[in-house]
C-alpha cells in the first residue's frame, strides 16, 4: 500500500486509479495514507472520475477517511439520491492525515477509466469553528501556519490550558464608606477559571453591610453543596457561604470594618454571576443641638463615624471657646461615638471697651457701659481747643468686632488741635513794643540751646521756626530744651517739652545768608492745648490777601529789648509789612552782600525805626489776623535783619512761610 | 507642621519697653483661633498677657492693659509684643502660643535690669 | 479673675502607678479647662482641653474629667517621662489664669 509522501517532504502530489487514463481491472484494491505537517490539514479533489455506479458504492468505490471518520465513499460520474460522485467538491482531512482506498470488484459490464485526484496539505484555520460548536478560545483566537494561539482582553490572563481566559479581578480593595462590587462581566456571563478576591477596607469603627442586587446566577448542583463555582464571603469573626444557584442571598450585617469576597469558577458553564452593593454604619454620635443663636449644617437623621457638623452664628454672633474666638467650628464623629470637640458657644459679639481718645472723651448711647453688637458710641473731641478731624464721631459695634465709624473706618477718630487762638484783640495801628499777657500768644516757643531762639507750636507735637536758631543742633536733637506755656522767660511754671528730631530746610546753607531760613521741630510727645498752648494755624491759599504791603503783623519773643537785654517777660510788636522793592533796596547798600533779600523772605517794620524784632526772637512767628476765618496764622519766621535792632531805614527780614507749605506738609505727613 | 518662634532682645532697661516678636509656621494666623502671649517669672506660674484673634481684634489681662500692645503682621505671618515700663518684676520667660496652648513657643527668657 | 487651686503641690508616685492631679476653679468655668505638662527648661506641652479631650498624639493613659469649679487628670500608669509639672488653666473669661502646678516626682 503506497503511504505518499510524509511531512517533512513537500506534501502535495497526484493519485490516480491503476492504469490510467485507460480502464482499471478487475478485483484491484489500492490505499494511500498522506500524511501533513502538525496544524495542517489535506485537501483533495478529482479532475476525472468514472467507476462503476452501485447501490450504496458496493462494488467499485474510492473511499476517503481522516482516523476513524469516513469522509466520503465515492462512486459513479454524478451522485444520485444514494450514491455520490466527487463531482467539484473538495474534500478535506479532519487533522493532519487522510486516507484513500480504491477497491473494484471482480466484474465490470463496461469499461470505466477509474479517476485522477490531486491532494496538498494547507493550514488548518482552528479559529473558524462551526456553528454551534465551542469556540477554539475564550477571547481571541489568532491563526498561523501551522497552528494558532489564544490571547485575552485586558484585565484578564490566559490559562494555562492556553484557550481559556481566567479574569484577573484579586486584589481590589473597596475603602468608601459605600459601593457596588460585582463579578466579572456582570451581568454577561463570568469568565472560567478564575479566582477572584475583593476586600471592603474601612476604617476602624465602621460596620459593611452587604446587599445582593438585581440578579444572582452562580453555576450549582442539585444534590452537592456549590461543587463548580462559589461565592464566599469573610470577616475576622466568620464566614458567610459559599453561594450559589439563582436566588439571591439575604443580607449580611458583617458587624466588621474589612470583609474579603472570593468567587471561584471552573472551566464549564454559562451564568450571569451577582452583584453587591455594600453600605456601612457606626456607632452614632448625640445629636448635635445648635448652641442658641447659632444652627447646624448639615442637618442628618444622625451622625455617624466620619461624619461631621459645623457651627455658624447669625450675625452679631462669634464662636467663643470660653474666652477664645473661634472663626470656624467643625466637629468630627470619632468611632467611639463622640465628638472630637466640645460645642463652642454663640456669643453676642462684644466690641469691648472703646479707646480713650486722646484730648476727647467717649459717651455710651445705647446704654451706660454697652459694648455689644450694634451698639453705638459718640466720640467727641474737647471743646474750643479741638476740633474733630473729618469724622462725625459715631461709632457702632459692627459683626466683626470693631467699632466703625459710618465712614467704615476702625480707627479712632483724630481731634485735631484748634489753631490761631488768642486772648488777644488785635488794635488796627502800632502802639510800640508791648508786653503780652496770657493767651495772647499760646503758639509761643522758648528754645533753650547754645542761644535762646524762639519757635511756633503746629498742631500738637511740631514746633516751626529758623534754620540757623537750631542749626547747630541738628544732629543732637535732645539738646533742644523747648517751654511753652508761660510769659516769663525765667519762670519755673512751663511745660516742658522735648525734642526727637530736627528737620532743616535742604535749600539753607549756614553762614551763607538766610534763604530757606526754616525748619521744624518734631516733638517726642504731644502736648495738652489749652489756653496758654494753642498751635498757631498754617497760611491759607488766600493768606496773601491779609499779608500785602502796609498789614500789620505782630511778632513776639524774649529777644533783647532797647535796654540791650532779653526780655524777662514775652513782648510784641504790631508792624507792617514792608513793599518788596523797598526792603531789597535798603539791603543792598554795604555791609550787606547784594541779593541778601530774596523772594523767600518778606519784610516789616517801620522806616523811622524802633520797632522790630530783635537777637532771642529769631525762630518766632510773624503772625497776621485772617479776618475771614478770624484766626491767627504764621506769615514769616523771625530771621535776619539790621545789626542795630529797630534801626531807621532797616527792616526786620522774616522767612516766608507760604512759599514752604508743600515742604512743611512733607514732613509732617512722613514723619 | 504648626512651628512657633519667639524672637527679641534678651536684655531690656527698666522703664524702657520690651518688643517681642512672635514668627509662625505651618498655619496662617489669619485663618483662625486667638494667639496668645504668656510668660513664666522665673520660679513662678505661668501668666497670660493677651491675644490677638485670627481678625485682629485684641484681649488684654487687665493688669497689664495700660502697658500692653499686641499687633501683628499678616504679610510675615507674625504677631508681637509690646510692653511698656517695665521693671524688674517684668523678668520672665515669654511663650507665645496658639489657641488654648496646642502648639507653643520654645520660649525666650527676658531679663529687665540696668 | 478666676483663681485656680492646684493640689497637691507635689506628687510622689512610683512608676506603674496612677496618679491623681486635682484642681479647683474659683468660679464656675464650664469645661473650659486645659492641662500641660512641662518639663525644666521646655515649654509646656498640650494634654487634655475641654476638661476631657486628649489631642491626638496624647497617650490614652492620661485623661481628664469635671465640670464647673472641679477637675482631674489622671494619668493611669505613670512612665518614666511623665515626672514633670501638670499645670490647669482655664480660659472661660478674661483674665485667662493657670494653675501654681503640682509637680510629680518619682517615689
Known amino acids: 500500500t503506497p503511504l505518499g509522501p510524509k511531512w517533512p517532504e513537500p506534501v502535495f502530489g497526484r493519485l490516480a486509479s491503476p492504469g490510467f487514463p485507460g480502464e482499471y481491472a478487475n478485483d484491484q484494491e489500492r490505499r494511500w495514507t498522506l500524511t501533513a505537517p502538525p496544524g495542517y490539514r489535506l485537501r483533495l479533489y478529482f479532475t476525472h472520475f468514472d467507476l462503476e455506479l452501485s447501490h450504496l458504492c458496493e462494488y467499485d468505490f474510492v473511499k476517503l477517511s481522516s482516523g476513524a471518520k469516513v469522509l466520503a465513499t465515492l462512486c459513479g460520474q454524478e451522485s444520485t439520491d444514494t450514491e455520490r460522485a466527487p463531482g467539484k467538491d473538495t474534500f478535506y482531512s479532519l487533522g493532519s492525515s487522510l486516507d484513500i482506498t480504491f477497491r473494484s470488484d471482480y466484474s465490470n459490464e463496461k469499461p470505466f477509466t477509474g479517476f485522477e485526484a490531486f491532494y496538498a496539505a494547507e493550514d488548518i484555520d482552528e479559529c473558524q469553528v462551526a456553528p454551534g460548536e465551542a469556540p477554539t478560545c475564550d477571547h481571541h483566537c489568532h491563526n498561523h501556519l501551522g497552528g494558532f494561539y489564544c490571547s485575552c482582553r485586558a484585565g484578564y490572563v490566559l490559562h494555562r490550558n492556553k484557550r481559556t481566559c481566567s479574569a484577573l479581578c484579586s486584589g481590589q480593595v473597596f475603602t468608601q464608606r459605600s459601593g457596588e462590587l460585582s463579578s466579572p462581566e456582570y451581568p454577561r456571563p463570568y469568565p472560567k477559571l478564575s479566582s477572584c478576591t475583593y476586600s471592603i477596607s474601612l476604617e476602624e469603627g465602621f460596620s459593611v453591610i452587604l446587599d445582593f442586587v438585581e440578579s444572582f446566577d452562580v453555576e450549582t448542583h442539585p444534590e452537592t453543596l456549590c461543587p463548580y463555582d462559589f461565592l464566599k464571603i469573610q470577616t475576622d469573626r466568620e464566614e458567610h457561604g459559599p453561594f450559589c444557584g439563582k436566588t439571591l442571598p439575604h443580607r449580611i450585617e458583617t458587624k466588621s470594618n474589612t470583609v474579603t469576597i472570593t468567587f471561584v469558577t471552573d472551566e464549564s458553564g454559562d451564568h450571569t454571576g451577582w452583584k453587591i452593593h455594600y453600605t456601612s454604619t457606626a456607632q452614632p454620635c448625640p445629636y448635635p443641638m445648635a448652641p442658641p443663636n447659632g444652627h447646624v449644617s448639615p442637618v442628618q437623621a444622625k451622625y455617624i463615624l466620619k461624619d461631621s457638623f459645623s457651627i455658624f452664628c447669625e450675625t452679631g454672633y462669634e464662636l467663643l471657646q470660653g474666652h477664645l474666638p473661634l472663626k470656624s467650628f467643625t466637629a468630627v464623629c470619632q468611632k467611639d461615638g463622640s465628638w472630637d470637640r466640645p460645642m463652642p458657644a454663640c456669643s453676642i459679639v462684644d466690641c469691648g471697651p472703646p479707646d480713650d481718645l486722646p484730648s476727647g472723651r467717649v459717651e455710651y448711647i445705647t446704654g451706660p457701659g454697652v459694648t455689644t453688637y450694634k451698639a453705638v458710641i459718640q466720640y467727641s473731641c474737647e471743646e474750643t481747643f479741638y476740633t474733630m478731624k473729618v469724622n462725625d464721631g459715631k461709632y457702632v459695634c459692627e459683626a466683626d468686632g470693631f467699632w466703625t465709624s459710618s465712614k467704615g473706618e476702625k480707627s479712632l477718630p483724630v481731634c485735631e488741635p484748634v489753631c490761631g487762638l488768642s486772648a488777644r484783640t488785635t488794635g488796627g495801628r502800632i502802639y510800640g513794643g508791648q508786653k503780652a499777657k496770657p493767651g495772647d500768644f499760646p503758639w509761643q516757643v522758648l528754645i533753650l540751646g547754645g542761644t535762646t531762639a524762639a519757635g511756633a507750636l503746629l498742631y500738637d507735637n511740631w514746633v516751626l521756626t529758623a534754620a540757623h536758631a537750631v542749626y547747630e543742633q541738628k544732629h543732637d536733637a535732645s539738646a533742644l530744651d523747648i517751654r511753652m506755656g508761660t510769659l516769663k522767660r525765667l519762670s519755673p511754671h512751663y511745660t516742658q517739652a522735648w525734642s526727637e528730631a530736627v528737620f532743616i530746610h535742604e535749600g539753607y546753607t549756614h553762614d551763607a545768608g538766610f534763604d530757606n531760613d526754616i525748619a521744624l521741630i518734631k516733638l517726642n510727645n504731644k502736648v495738652v492745648i489749652n489756653s496758654n498752648i494753642t498751635p498757631i494755624c498754617l497760611p491759607r491759599k488766600e493768606a496773601e490777601s491779609f499779608m500785602r504791603t502796609d498789614d500789620i503783623g505782630t511778632a513776639s519773643g524774649w529777644g533783647l529789648t532797647q535796654r540791650g537785654f532779653l526780655a524777662r517777660n514775652l513782648m510784641y510788636v504790631d508792624i507792617p509789612i514792608v513793599d518788596h522793592q523797598k526792603c531789597t533796596a535798603a539791603y543792598e547798600k554795604p555791609p550787606y552782600p547784594r541779593g541778601s533779600v530774596t523772594a523767600n523772605m518778606l519784610c516789616a517794620g517801620l522806616e523811622s525805626g524802633g520797632k522790630d524784632s530783635c537777637r532771642g526772637d529769631s525762630g518766632g512767628a510773624l503772625v497776621f489776623l485772617d479776618s475771614e476765618t478770624e484766626r491767627w496764622f504764621v506769615g514769616g519766621i523771625v530771621s535776619w535783619g539790621s545789626m542795630n535792632c529797630g534801626e531807621a531805614g532797616q527792616y526786620g527780614v522774616y522767612t516766608k512761610v507760604i512759599n514752604y507749605i508743600p515742604w512743611i506738609e512733607n514732613i509732617i505727613s512722613d514723619f | 507642621q504648626v512651628q512657633l518662634q519667639e524672637s527679641g532682645p534678651g536684655l531690656v532697661k527698666p522703664s524702657e519697653t520690651l518688643s517681642l516678636t512672635c514668627t509662625v509656621s505651618g498655619y496662617s494666623i489669619t485663618s483662625d483661633y486667638a494667639w496668645n502671649w504668656i510668660r513664666q517669672p522665673p520660679g513662678k506660674k505661668l501668666e497670660w498677657m493677651g491675644y490677638i484673634s485670627y481678625s485682629g481684634r485684641t484681649s488684654y489681662n487687665p493688669s497689664l492693659k495700660s502697658r500692653i500692645t499686641i499687633s501683628r503682621d499678616t504679610s510675615k505671618n507674625q504677631f508681637s509684643l509690646k510692653l511698656s515700663s517695665v521693671t524688674a518684676a517684668d523678668t520672665a520667660v515669654y511663650y507665645c502660643?496658639?489657641?488654648?496652648?496646642?502648639?507653643w513657643g520654645q520660649g525666650t527668657l527676658v531679663t529687665v535690669s540696668s | 479673675e478666676i483663681v485656680m487651686t492646684q493640689s497637691p503641690a507635689t506628687l510622689s508616685v512610683s512608676p506603674g502607678e496612677r496618679a491623681t492631679l486635682s484642681c479647683k476653679a474659683s468660679q464656675n468655668v464650664g469645661t473650659n479647662v486645659a492641662w500641660y505638662q512641662q518639663k525644666p527648661g521646655q515649654s509646656p506641652r498640650a494634654l487634655i482641653y475641654s476638661a476631657s479631650y486628649r489631642y491626638s498624639g496624647i497617650p490614652a493613659r492620661f485623661s481628664g474629667s469635671g465640670s464647673g469649679t472641679e477637675f482631674t487628670l489622671t494619668i493611669s500608669s505613670l512612665q518614666s517621662e511623665d515626672f514633670a509639672v501638670y499645670f490647669c488653666h482655664q480660659y472661660n473669661s478674661n483674665p485667662l489664669t493657670f494653675g501654681g502646678g503640682t509637680k510629680v516626682e518619682i517615689k
Open positions: 502660643s496658639r489657641h488654648y496652648g496646642d502648639y
